[in-house]
């Protein structure tokens, strides 16, 4: 996170450490599911059950944690690694439903009325364990208030090279100052990027960190994240399909997906 | 020729009758009869909140047919009142009994509630009865558990701190 | 005739699950009677372990209840035992019988072993 | 639990002799008991029920009686084929319990 701030205890209970070959993170949904971003969880692809899922936990490096381990990971059939960052979502079944208390609870998913609290200008707070400006990770979960940018400001932003033209979808969403300075980063990815219904007085997410310009906090570029309430019925078809319950049971971790295996590819935010 | 007749035997027999079968407690004859002889049967029918039992295990039906030797082919069931057992524990969640402590006999009250702040009730109220079938069931005909389904969207940056 | 034919593994490793199903022709699993699951030892000792009514109600030996499951598919005329973490204390063969208990499978042997 | 107690282990009888095998409950059990033979390599074979009432199929040699806590099962006219382990069994009280078994054999 650029330009943020330490978060407290209590602040992002839903926040989710993975840690798989790289740094990256999650949100917890209901109690036995992670909201994650694909490129994120895609080079586990082979093996899902190694993915070291840590959460109730501030510090990145703290042995104080719950642990949690996956049972299957669902990436959107519509991603493809090597080609841009449409469809950067996945979630991740977890082995074993987690104790919600106040250090470990679930993010709502957005209500059909959610657009009304993410308009061009409304405050979102990403949070993570991604770089800073000082160049390394956070020792501690940072975050950073960021207000969502024009759609079409976004798009013309990424326009011009080194980014392919239609880097920006329908399926995304920016936010960020156009002065720079505040940004998610990599390992960043996968986390949420949350607002608050003011009329619950709930928070939701809202977007999933996903990709961004090569240096973190640019002027003039933002940070773009996965359009999260364009999914509602994608998430909701698997959660109901592979089930709310962790089973608890032994077996090797599944990975599903609905498109071949491609080449690898590696953007920013990736790590 | 003088015609032979031979010996002309008459017999005559009464069917043992079997005994009077006498109704369990809770439970009723049928049919009534005056007396039951060779083949005759009678059923047991359990009033509504009682279920037939053979010791522990459950019958769906009774019947009994009157031997030769006026006996009854089986024993009188009983007519034991419906008993849902004690309730399923509700994950994050607990169960009171409103009847009365471990009352789990036929219209029975039991309420399920959720661990406070984390979790919320879903599928419904939580107050079950055990009913004639024997399963606790909800006020909206449910037989499986209520769920306690974890809040969510809770943060210390809006509550002020836990 | 009524039949039942019991139908599992045979070999199961410690710590595992067990599932067995007990498959019942000439007799609707739903018309009358529990439908029982009993082990037998090496050494013959016999365990009641629990049933299955007609209804579908169950009633499990609470030497076993924190790892017992019964459960029935109405449709194919079976009903099945799952047992938890099973040790080698659960080598057994395992038959599962109509109570009244006048009709019993011919059993099914399950050894625990790693 | 109630305990079924079948006292003797083996019991030593001759083809044509009458034989009885007892198990005591150590509560209460009305009348519901069973009785059940078992061979080598087979299921248990149901043959008396409720204490007193032969299965259908079950040869008249075999009677069962008693009631409460004292239940006898009597062979009459042994024979051959009925050389086999017989078990106890009550269904009156949750949780149901075997008795550990009499082995019959030939003198």
């Known amino acids: 996170i650029y330009g943020g701030q330490k978060a407290k205890p209590g602040d992002f209970p839903w926040q989710v450490l993975i840690l798989g070959g790289t740094t990256a993170a999650g949100a917890l949904l209901y109690d036995n599911w992670v909201l994650t971003a694909a490129h994120a969880v895609y080079e586990q692809k082979h093996d899902a059950s190694a993915l070291d899922i840590r959460m109730g936990t501030l510090k990145r490096l703290s042995p104080h944690y719950t642990q949690a381990w996956s049972e299957a990971v669902f990436i959107h059939e519509g991603y493809t690694h090597d080609a841009g960052f449409d469809n950067d979502i996945a979630l991740i079944k977890l082995n074993n439903k987690v104790v919600i208390n106040s250090n470990i609870t679930p993010i709502c998913l957005p209500r059909k009325e959610a657009e009304s609290f993410m308009r061009t200008d409304d405050i979102g707070t990403a949070s993570g364990w991604g770089l800073t400006q000082r160049g390394f990770l956070a020792r501690n979960l940072m975050y950073v208030d960021i207000p969502i940018v024009d759609h079409q400001k976004c798009t013309a932003a990424y326009e011009k090279p080194p980014y392919p033209r239609g880097s920006v979808t329908a399926n995304m969403l920016c936010a960020g100052l156009e002065s720079g300075g505040k940004d998610s980063c990599r390992g960043d990815s996968g986390g949420a990027l949350v607002f608050l219904d003011s009329e619950t007085e709930r928070w939701f997410v809202g977007g999933i960190v996903s990709w961004g310009s090569m240096n973190c906090g640019e002027a003039g570029q933002y940070g773009v994240y996965t359009k999260v309430i364009n999914y509602i019925p994608w998430i909701e078809n698997i959660i109901s399909d592979f089930g709310g319950g962790g089973s608890g049971g032994g077996g090797s971790a599944k990975f599903v997906a609905a498109w071949t295996l491609k080449a690898a590819a590696h953007h920013h935010h990736h790590h | 020729m003088a015609s032979m007749t031979g010996w002309k035997i008459h017999y005559t027999s009464t069917a043992h009758a079997c005994p009077y079968p006498m109704a369990p407690p809770n439970g009723h004859v049928s049919p009534v009869q005056a007396k039951y002889i060779l083949k005759d049967s009678f059923s047991i029918f359990c009033e509504t909140g009682y279920e037939l039992l053979q010791g522990h295990l459950p019958l769906k039906s009774f019947t009994a047919v009157c031997q030769k030797d006026g006996s009854w082919d089986r024993p009188m069931p009983a007519c034991s009142i419906v008993d849902c057992g004690p309730p399923d524990d509700l994950p994050s969640g607990r169960v009171e009994y409103i009847t009365g402590p471990g009352v789990t006999t036929y219209k029975a009250v039991i309420q399920y509630s959720c661990e406070e702040t984390f979790y919320t009730m879903k599928v419904n109220d939580g107050k079950y009865v055990c009913e004639a079938d024997g399963f606790w069931t909800s006020s909206k005909g449910e037989k499986s558990l209520p769920v306690c389904e974890p809040v969510c969207g809770l943060s210390a940056r809006t509550t002020g701190g836990r | 005739d009524v039949q039942l034919q019991e139908s599992g593994p045979g070999l199961v490793k410690p710590s595992q699950s067990l599932s067995l199903t007990c498959t019942v022709t000439?007799?609707?699993?739903?018309?009358?009677?529990?439908w029982n699951w009993i082990r037998q030892f090496p050494g013959n000792k016999l365990e009641w372990m629990g049933y299955?009514?007609?209804?579908?109600?169950?009633s499990y030996n609470p030497s076993l209840k924190s790892r017992i499951s019964i459960t029935r598919n109405t449709s194919t005329n079976q009903f099945f035992l799952q047992l938890n973490s099973v040790t080698t204390e659960d080598t057994a063969t395992y038959f599962c019988?109509?109570?009244?208990?006048?009709?019993w499978g011919q059993g099914t042997t399950l050894t625990v072993s790693s | 639990d109630i305990v079924m107690t079948q006292s003797q282990k083996f019991m030593s009888t001759s083809v044509g002799d009458r034989v009885s095998v007892t198990c005591k409950a150590s509560?209460?059990?009305?009348?519901?008991v069973a009785w059940f033979q078992q061979k080598p390599g087979q299921s248990p074979k149901p043959l008396i029920y409720?204490?007193?009432y032969r299965y259908s199929g079950v040869p008249d040699r075999f009677t069962g009686s008693g009631s409460g806590t004292d239940f006898t099962l009597t062979i009459s006219n042994v024979q051959s084929e009925d050389l086999a382990e017989y078990f106890c069994?009550?269904?009156?009280?949750?949780?149901?319990?075997f008795g550990a078994g009499t082995k019959l054999e030939l003198n």
């Open positions: 409720s204490a007193s």
């Open positions: 000439g007799y609707s699993i739903t018309s009358d009677y529990a």
């Open positions: 509560q209460n059990v009305g009348s519901n």
């Open positions: 069994h009550q269904y009156n009280t949750y949780p149901l319990t």
């Open positions: 019988a109509r109570y009244w208990g006048d009709y």
């Open positions: 299955i009514s007609y209804s579908g109600r169950t």
